[in-house]
Structures are given as structure tokens and as C-alpha cells.
């Protein structure tokens, strides 16, 4: 019986040309983790494998860096950046589980920045 | 260099408390799993605690649930364990070891702090 | 749990000597996803705290001499020290840590004639 739960960022958002750290976290559960992937819908990020540690995937390989920990940091974001992120996690004897995470990027101006620490 | 240096070892009586700690050094803590890891008079080795990186998960032997806690403090490098019940049993060398991430096995260990429960 | 039963308990071993140790668990350390046996070696000198030696099984931790081997696979485990050296006087463990709670064998102390 699958007793494990994932934790994650939930929805958030970050400006264009920022970064931003994607975070799961799997409790409730005494199974060991043997690999974590990272997805981009259908697209492979990255993945964390016992043996192997850290692969990122090639056509990621200068926006994405591993960690902290399980977790992923995407930087340089674009607006395409926007949409739905997944960490699957293997684990032993439980199988699979998947977490899911929102991104939205949005545009950043001069004005925004301006109007936000403008003093009174 | 890698070190991990254990103290708050002592004589404690049956069903006291005692707080162990561990310092770590020489590598980036909050990057380690971390366990502790006893040594029984008898020479056998036994895992008590486990923690995760970030500290959200913690994992114990059935022969410490309830009566010990692992904790840590990756701020100031440091790794914790609360002890309390305290049976004869108890009595060994605790030592902290690291993990790798998704690597269960124990890649460094300290010097270990000896606890004693004796009446 | 997983029990780990280390043999002999003790061997004395002239230098030189090739020397074999085993460790049984009750239960594969092998997992097919990526057929790694989740093993480790341990070395503990007289007076110092245990050392990694080998993990998945026969994979030698960095800086760990040649001439100290792992091998074997699901529940039967061989630690292998080709030709043993004064220093190499020192109890050694294996683990499982396959799932939990992580276990130890009980130990084999090599000592030297």
C-alpha cells in the first residue's frame, strides 16, 4: 500500500530573467527513493539517480541546475517557461510518485520595478 | 576535510534524558542526509535515526520510536539527538555519519560520544 | 528486517595471505530497477570509528587500496582483501541498506599471526 505523500511548491510565479527553485518533498512513507525525475509536460529536465547522481538533460543543460537537495533550479526564465513542472519520485518497495508544480513567468518592466520601491 | 565531531556523551540513569550533538565541518551540510549510528558494548552496530537533507523527514528503528528524536540546524552545521526513556540497552558509542543523497550507505563517520544508562 | 549474518565471527591471517569473508541476508539487497545490490563494506580499526570500504556491493570507495574487493549479488556477499598487510587488522561490517530499518552483520574480526 502507496502511504507516501508529496509536498511541493504548489503554484508560484517568478519574473522573466529570474530563477526559481522547484521543491518536492515525499513523507508519510519508509520507502527509499532510488531515482527523481524532473518534467517539463513531456519533456525530461533532469533526473537524480542513486547510482549515477545528477543528469541534465542536454538541451537544458545551461538554464537548469541540481538542487537544493531533490529539488531544481531553473534559471534565465522566459514566458515559455510557464506551465506545468512534475517530480516523479521511484521509490522501493512503493513505486512511483508524482508531484506537480505551476510555474507562471511573467513580465517584468522598468514601471513595475519603479511603482514597487517608489518612496512617498 | 570532511569531519564530524560528536559530544554531550555522559552517565545518565534508567528513563533520563540526554541531548547528543554533532558538528560537522569541511563539506556542505545541507546537501547530506545524516543518521546516527550506535556501537553496543558488544560491538554490534545498530542505525537509530535518519534525517533528510532539509531536515522534512525522519526515519527510526522500531527499538527507538518514541523515545529518541533526530534533529538538525543546518544554520550552524549541526546535527542533534534527543534521547529520553532511557533503558540499559541504550548504553553505546553514538556516532553521526553522512549520507549522499539517494545513497543509504554511511560515507563518513565521527569520532562517536559514549552514553552510558546506568543506575 | 533484514537480517545480515557475517562469517567466520574471527580469522587469524599470516601477511600476505589472501583472506575471504562472508556476508548473507535474509532477504535479495538487489534492485531490478537498476540492478544495484545495496551493500556496503565497512573497516574498524582498534579505537577508531568504521570506515567506508565498498558499497553497491563491489563499487571501492576513493582512496580504499585494490587489493580490498567486493563481490557477489541478491543475498550472498563476499569481501575479498588479496594479500593482507598489518594495517588491514580490524573488524569488519557489511549493511544492507536496501530498506528499512538498516541492518549490520555482526562483524569479522581479521587479526594478524
Known amino acids: 500500500m502507496m502511504t507516501g505523500t508529496i509536498e511541493t511548491t504548489g503554484n508560484i510565479s517568478a519574473e522573466k530573467g529570474g530563477s526559481i527553485i522547484l521543491q518536492c518533498h515525499l513523507s508519510s512513507t519508509t520507502a527509499q527513493v532510488t531515482a527523481v525525475n524532473w518534467e517539463q509536460q513531456d519533456q525530461l529536465l533532469a533526473i537524480c539517480n542513486a547510482d549515477l547522481g545528477w543528469h541534465i538533460s542536454p538541451s537544458f543543460k545551461d538554464r537548469v541546475a541540481p538542487g537544493p537537495g531533490l529539488g531544481l533550479t531553473l534559471q534565465s526564465l522566459t514566458v515559455n517557461d510557464t506551465g506545468e513542472y512534475f517530480c516523479i519520485y521511484h521509490t522501493y518497495p512503493d513505486g512511483t510518485y508524482t508531484g506537480r508544480i505551476f510555474l507562471e513567468v511573467l513580465e517584468s518592466s522598468v514601471a513595475e520595478h519603479g511603482a514597487r520601491f517608489q518612496i512617498p | 576535510e570532511v569531519q564530524l565531531v560528536e559530544s554531550g556523551g555522559g552517565l545518565v540513569k534508567p528513563g533520563g534524558s540526554l541531548k547528543l550533538s554533532c558538528a560537522a565541518s569541511g563539506f556542505a551540510f545541507s546537501d547530506y542526509d545524516m543518521s546516527w549510528v550506535r556501537q553496543t558494548p558488544e560491538k554490534r552496530l545498530e542505525w537509530v535515526a535518519y534525517i533528510s537533507d532539509g531536515g522534512y523527514n525522519t526515519y527510526y528503528p522500531d527499538t527507538v520510536k518514541g523515545r529518541f528524536t533526530i534533529s538538525r540546524d543546518n544554520a550552524k552545521n549541526t546535527l542533534y539527538l534527543q534521547m529520553s526513556s532511557l533503558k540499559s540497552e541504550d548504553t553505546a558509542i553514538y556516532y553521526c555519519?553522512?549520507?549522499?543523497?539517494?545513497?543509504?550507505?554511511?560515507?563518513?563517520w565521527g569520532q562517536g560520544t559514549t552514553l552510558t544508562v546506568s543506575s | 528486517d533484514i537480517v545480515m549474518s557475517q562469517s567466520p565471527s574471527s580469522l587469524a591471517v599470516s601477511v600476505g595471505e589472501k583472506v575471504t569473508m562472508t556476508c548473507k541476508s535474509s532477504q535479495s539487497l538487489l534492485y531490478s530497477s537498476n540492478q544495484k545490490n545495496y551493500l556496503a563494506w565497512y573497516q574498524q580499526k582498534p579505537g577508531q570509528s568504521p570506515k567506508l570500504l565498498i558499497y553497491w556491493a563491489s563499487t571501492r570507495e576513493s582512496g580504499v587500496p585494490d587489493r580490498f574487493t567486493g563481490s557477489g549479488s541478491g543475498t550472498d556477499f563476499t569481501l575479498t582483501i588479496s594479500s593482507v598487510k598489518a594495517e588491514d587488522l580490524a573488524v569488519y561490517y557489511c549493511q544492507q541498506y536496501h530498506s528499512y530499518p538498516w541492518t549490520f552483520g555482526g562483524g569479522t574480526k581479521l587479526e594478524i599471526k
Open positions: 555519519a553522512r549520507q549522499i543523497l539517494l545513497r543509504y550507505y554511511f560515507d563518513y
